[in-house]
């Protein structure tokens, strides 16, 4: 056997290249069969009517054919013919790859709750082979579970990813990635998430800055929730009691002027949309007011002032100890 | 000159023999599928056999099939057609053709 | 049994065009081939593939090409163009070859 030929794989719409080899060529015919083992090339002859077969080389050892615009129907072998006695027959096999034409991602929701199992399918419609389909969460790869269905020698792959939403993944994107032999590159399509969830609630304390509450101060406390959709509803209330009579209520904000030891208690920040609702409660300490010490005399000062400093530190200290984590949010 | 001369017909009873031949020249004739085709009197051009340039394949019409071979030597140039079994419907003018799939070069044919 | 039809005699006035054709299912695949041949003559080929002459034949022979029908055209048709034209090709196999019974033209 002396005449040689090699396997051709192209992607659709390409050109492929039909080779026939001889070696220790006597002259002999070449002849190109199509996979109906119809001639295409008879020497450097074109017998048949597909003008996408010319001619790229014709010589005692070698016929080379090109076939552009390849589609899925010219896949099969071809056989090179050479008139020896006996004759000799060998054959190359066109595999034609045809990417996905269409790459769909359909969420089930468009939009889900936190806590909700929702289903994302892609589908990749008619390629050759089988496309994978690869699912990410933001960068995070998940896993999928993909059919294939089969159809005149293309498949359809569908993947389903089960998908449990938190609200960390609200604006994330969920993406369908394709590895198919005939592309290049990264073909993707993609979603973004749109999760629902109940409100985070968060108390700031705004005045007084230092953190330290003291008899006839003020009190500003601001109601931070975020929630999607946003809170429709935020409220102030005291836990067990009675709201002070002094106490002053504007959307977030709850004011209390010239604090007293009978505003102590818990001050709740309730917050609501569709979801559902969250608090954070706020446990008020009013301290007495500061000690107004008289200056002290000559011979006493070192000792006075350290001792009068030691003691503002131990007591500004304890307060700040006591006072230091009041909010507790649910 | 290109040019084929074909020889050997001639008045047969049905039943009986006859060998045709065909002389090449002009040509390297080793390196050409070499075919006969028919014309009975009157009527159209029917092929009859075909061999391929090294005489490893053949092929036949229907209506020979089994009675004619065809065969070369391509060291004498020369391509011949053995018919036995001759019938009435045979008889017609030979003509060898040179083939590169069409027929290029005919001969004047023998009867 | 495979076949190729032509019309059996067609005829043309002097200088016109005239078109001869042959049907076929293997003319869906394969090129047809056209002979002429004139009374006690041998067979010449004068169309081939897509529509190519062989050196010595007019360029008033034309050929095409359309679904299972192959045509040969004379545009300007001569009195020496009057002869007997066979089509020719060969079964999907590419083995078997077969003739067109053959189209009488007479320049009138």
């Known amino acids: 056997q002396n005449l040689f030929t090699k396997d051709v794989t192209v992607i659709e719409g390409e050109v492929a290249t039909i080779s026939c080899q001889v070696n220790k060529s006597d002259d002999s015919v070449i002849q190109l069969l199509n996979p109906n083992r119809q001639t295409i090339y008879f020497r450097d002859f074109r017998p048949l009517k597909d003008s996408r077969f010319q001619l790229l080389n014709f010589s005692s050892s070698e016929l080379k054919v090109s076939l552009t615009n390849v589609s899925i129907s010219d896949e099969g072998r071809y056989f090179c013919q050479l008139y020896t006695d006996p004759p000799q027959e060998s054959y190359t096999t066109i595999t034609v790859l045809v990417p996905p034409r269409n790459l769909m991602i359909d969420i089930q929701k468009d939009t889900a709750v936190e806590g909700e199992e929702i289903e994302v399918n892609c589908t990749a419609m008619a390629s050759k082979p089988a496309t994978t389909i690869r699912w990410f969460k933001g960068n995070t790869e998940l896993k999928g579970k993909s059919e294939v269905e089969e159809w005149s020698d293309m498949y359809t792959v569908t993947s389903q990813l089960m998908l449990k939403v938190h609200k960390e993944d609200d604006g994330v994107p969920v993406i369908c990635q394709v590895e198919h032999p005939a592309v290049t590159g990264n073909l993707q399509t993609q979603r973004y998430l749109e999760v629902q969830y109940k409100p985070q609630v968060h108390i700031q304390m705004t005045y007084p800055l230092q953190g330290l509450t003291r008899e006839g101060d003020a009190l500003e406390l601001t109601c931070e929730a975020i929630g999607k959709p946003q809170p429709v509803m935020v409220t102030w209330v005291r836990v067990d009691d009675e709201m002070p009579q002094h106490a002053v209520l504007s959307g977030p904000n709850l004011f209390i002027n010239n604090l007293n030891k009978t505003d102590n208690g818990t001050y709740r920040c309730e917050a609501s949309n569709i979801v559902g609702k969250a608090h954070s409660d706020y446990m008020l300490y009013v301290y007495d007011p500061p000690t107004t010490i008289p200056p002290p005399t000559t011979t006493t000062t070192t000792t006075t002032t350290t001792t009068t400093t030691i003691l503002t530190i131990i007591t500004d200290s304890r307060a700040g100890e006591e006072g230091s984590i009041r909010a507790v949010d649910h | 000159e290109v040019q084929l001369l074909e020889s050997g017909g001639g008045l047969v009873q049905p039943g009986g023999s006859l060998r045709l031949s065909c002389a090449a020249s002009g040509f390297t004739f080793s390196m050409y599928t070499m075919s006969w085709v028919r014309q009975a009197p009157g009527k159209g051009l029917e092929w009859v056999s075909s061999i391929w340039s090294s005489g490893g394949k053949t092929s036949y019409a229907d209506s020979v099939k089994g009675r004619f071979t065809i065969s070369r030597d391509n060291s004498k140039n020369t391509l011949y057609l053995q018919m036995n079994s001759l019938r009435a419907e045979d008889t017609a003018v030979y003509y060898c053709a040179k083939e590169s799939w069409y027929f290029d070069l005919w001969g004047r044919g023998t009867l | 049994q495979y076949e190729l039809t032509q019309d059996p005699a067609v005829s043309v006035a002097l200088g016109q065009t005239v078109r001869i054709t042959c049907q076929g299912h293997?003319?869906?695949?394969?090129?047809a081939t056209w002979y002429q041949q004139k009374p006690g003559q041998a067979p010449v080929l004068v169309m081939y593939?897509?529509?190519n002459r062989p050196s010595g034949i007019p360029d008033r022979f034309s050929g095409s090409s359309s679904g299972n029908t192959a045509s040969l055209t004379i545009t300007g048709a001569q009195a020496e163009d009057e002869a007997d034209y066979y089509c020719n090709s060969r079964d999907n196999s590419g083995n078997h070859l077969v003739f067109g019974g053959g189209t009488n033209l007479t320049v009138l």
């Open positions: 293997s003319l869906r695949s394969y090129y």
């Open positions: 593939g897509e529509n």
